[in-house]
Interface confidence: low
């Protein structure tokens, strides 16, 4: 009579995490008498998965009734598969012995691979803001996926980026993997409304990639431009000087007026005008009583934006010779002449 063969027809089986895995095994003979066992791995380190003879294996069910007369099917189903279940499973026939059963023959093994979805990608930007023309780094992380093969792409406003580096860990075999990618993005003045997207494609996602996003508004600081001008006034002894603060981001801004270097007024920007590109404008004005000055006045508009070092623009308000002579009787308009910024 032909010697018993242990047949494991499938070399490999792939299952999604959470599903059940069916591992098939058949014998070609009822002889010799003895139990079958399923193991994960081979050699000394193998792990018992199912023992026909004894033990409690709550996740394992047999596909057919093993006690049924002439049964030769020893397939099993393992429920609620996780990545930790990946490995090669062996169906092993034992020969009844005394005191212990003796291993008789093993199947060729079935490799179980577990498909586990990557976690939602988490994108994080730089810890501190940077100004346009500078490069900032964004990182993207996703964990817990299997198998190892995965594709990651970066986009900025729909345009694919090429300056990034990606690692999949660990390098060797593992039950599940993590991906970490760092992209370098050059900021432009119009990036307040821009977005970076990290897109991950994996076999478990069936063509529907996962995306993580980050807004460049969290990473950019657009410094303001200042313009000081004099507005026409009806009252002859007053000058209305405005400081136009333009195209800044984020909102946080404090403005100080100085007259000849002395603080005249400090205010915090409140009612801002938002531009189409997401930056803000703001205007502050200072009313100068020209009759109180016998000499020219240097007016400085000083702006502290987003906790950075203050920037300023100064203008000389010229008091005319006639006005200097007659004090408050003067009827001529004071002239405003720009000076270089301080």
């Amino acid at each position: 009579e032909d010697e018993l063969q242990v047949i494991q027809p499938e070399k490999s089986v792939s299952v999604a995490a959470g599903e059940s895995a069916t591992l098939r095994c058949a014998m070609t003979s009822l002889i010799p008498v003895g139990p079958i066992m399923w193991f994960r791995g081979a050699g000394a380190g193998r792990e018992l998965i199912y023992n026909q003879k004894e033990g409690h294996f709550p996740r394992v069910t047999t596909v057919s009734e093993l006690t049924k007369r002439n049964n030769l099917d020893f397939s099993i189903s393992i429920s609620n598969i996780t990545p930790a279940d990946a490995g090669t499973y062996y169906c092993v026939k034992f020969r009844k012995g005394s005191p212990d059963d003796v291993e008789f023959k093993s199947g060729a093994g079935t490799e179980l691979s577990v498909r586990a979805k990557p976690s939602a990608p988490v994108v994080s930007g730089p810890a501190v803001r940077a100004t346009p023309e500078h490069t900032v780094s964004f990182t993207c992380e996703s964990h817990g996926f299997s198998p190892r093969d995965i594709t990651l792409k970066w986009f900025k406003n729909g345009n694919e980026l090429s300056d990034f580096q990606t690692n999949v860990d660990p390098a060797g075999d593992s039950v599940s993997y993590s991906i970490h990618s760092t992209a370098r993005v050059v900021l432009t003045r119009g990036d307040v409304h821009s977005q970076v997207i990290c897109e991950i494609a994996h076999i478990t996602l069936q063509g529907d990639p996962l995306r993580g996003t980050a807004n460049l508004s969290e990473a950019i600081r657009v410094p303001p431009t200042l313009e000081v001008t004099q507005q026409p006034m009806r009252a002859e002894n007053q000058a209305n000087v405005t400081c136009q603060v333009s195209n800044f981001y984020p909102r946080g801004l404090q403005l100080t007026w100085l007259e000849n270097g002395n603080v005249s007024r400090t205010e915090t920007a409140s009612t801002l005008i938002e531009n189409k590109d997401g930056t803000y404008n703001w205007m502050s004005w200072l009313l100068v009583n020209t009759c109180a000055h016998r000499d020219d006045v240097v007016l400085t508009c000083q702006v502290e934006h987003d906790g950075q070092q203050a920037v300023s623009k100064s203008y000389a308000l010229e008091i005319s010779a006639h006005q200097k002579e007659h004090g408050s009787d003067i009827t001529h308009e004071a002239a405003l002449a720009p000076t270089a910024p301080l």
């Epitope: 050699g43 000394a44 380190g45």
Partner: antibody
Framework: QVQLVQSGAEVKKPGASVKVSCKAS????????MHWVRQVPGQGLEWMGW????????KYSQKFQGRVTITRDTSATTAYMELSSLRSEDTAVYYC????????????WGKGTTVTVSS | DIQVTQSPSSLSASVGDRVTITCRAS??????LNWYQQKPGKAPKLLIH???SLQNGVPSRFSGSGSGTDFSLTINSLQPEDFATYYC?????????FGGGTKVEIK
């Protein structure tokens, strides 16, 4: 580079216990097993047990069952072997060795820790 | 438990000789057999794993063969640094076990 650094030599009295440490570096500690093997002077190698550093699974040789305890601290990347109820025949060099997870060969060994049991 | 019997327990050879050490397991262990070299006062060093796979960094004059119950380690053209004790080890089932060792001495 991959290395295993063991604790220093110990002299113990019969009935006492000894705990030997093995600090791993240069590889992912949890990706391998750690074996403990001893060698009595002038004799061959004797396997005592292993610990799978990843999941903590332990297997002891029946000969040492009940007297040996193998543990690991993954944060310190260190394995430990404690042998209790020492007798004079436990005088030996105790080695830790990194183990492969499939063929269970031992590819990196510590230099050994000499344990002398004497009254 | 699986017993591993190594032979001979010692042998004398000269530099340049071809030396073969054998190892027999008490039951079939497929290819779960490894070979180690140990010099006095030193830790063992892995030479061959899985019966015939040469460990990284080990000279190619060392080779292993066998499957099932009978295995051998061959050193082609023995070098002065090869005089040492050699052990085989089965890793098919626990307890893992070593052969008794073969001491290779200078003739």
């Amino acid at each position: 580079q991959v290395q295993l650094v063991q604790s220093g030599a110990e002299v113990k009295k019969p009935g006492a216990s000894v705990k030997v440490s093995c600090k791993a570096s240069g590889y992912t500690f949890t990706s391998n097993a750690m074996h403990w093997v001893r060698q009595v002077p002038g004799q061959g190698l004797e396997w005592m047990g292993w610990i799978k550093a990843g999941n903590g699974e332990i297997k002891y040789s029946q000969k040492f069952q009940g007297r040996v305890t193998i543990t690991r601290d993954t944060s310190a990347t260190t394995a430990y072997m404690e042998l209790s109820s020492l007798r004079s025949e436990d005088t030996a060099v105790y080695y830790c060795a990194r183990g492969d997870y499939y063929y269970y060969y031992m590819d990196v060994w510590g230099k050994g820790t000499t344990v002398t049991v004497s009254s | 438990d699986i017993q591993v019997t190594q032979s001979p327990s010692s042998l004398s050879a000269s530099v340049g000789d071809r030396v073969t050490i054998t190892c027999r397991a008490s039951q079939s262990i497929s290819d779960f057999l490894n070979w180690y070299q140990q010099k006095p006062g030193k830790a063992p060093k892995l030479l061959i794993h899985a019966a015939s796979s040469l460990q990284n960094g080990v000279p190619s004059r060392f080779s292993g063969s066998g499957s099932g119950t009978d295995f051998s380690l061959t050193i082609n053209s023995l070098q002065p640094e090869d005089f040492a004790t050699y052990y085989c080890q089965q890793s098919y089932s626990t307890p893992l076990s070593f052969g008794g060792g073969t001491k290779v001495e200078i003739k």
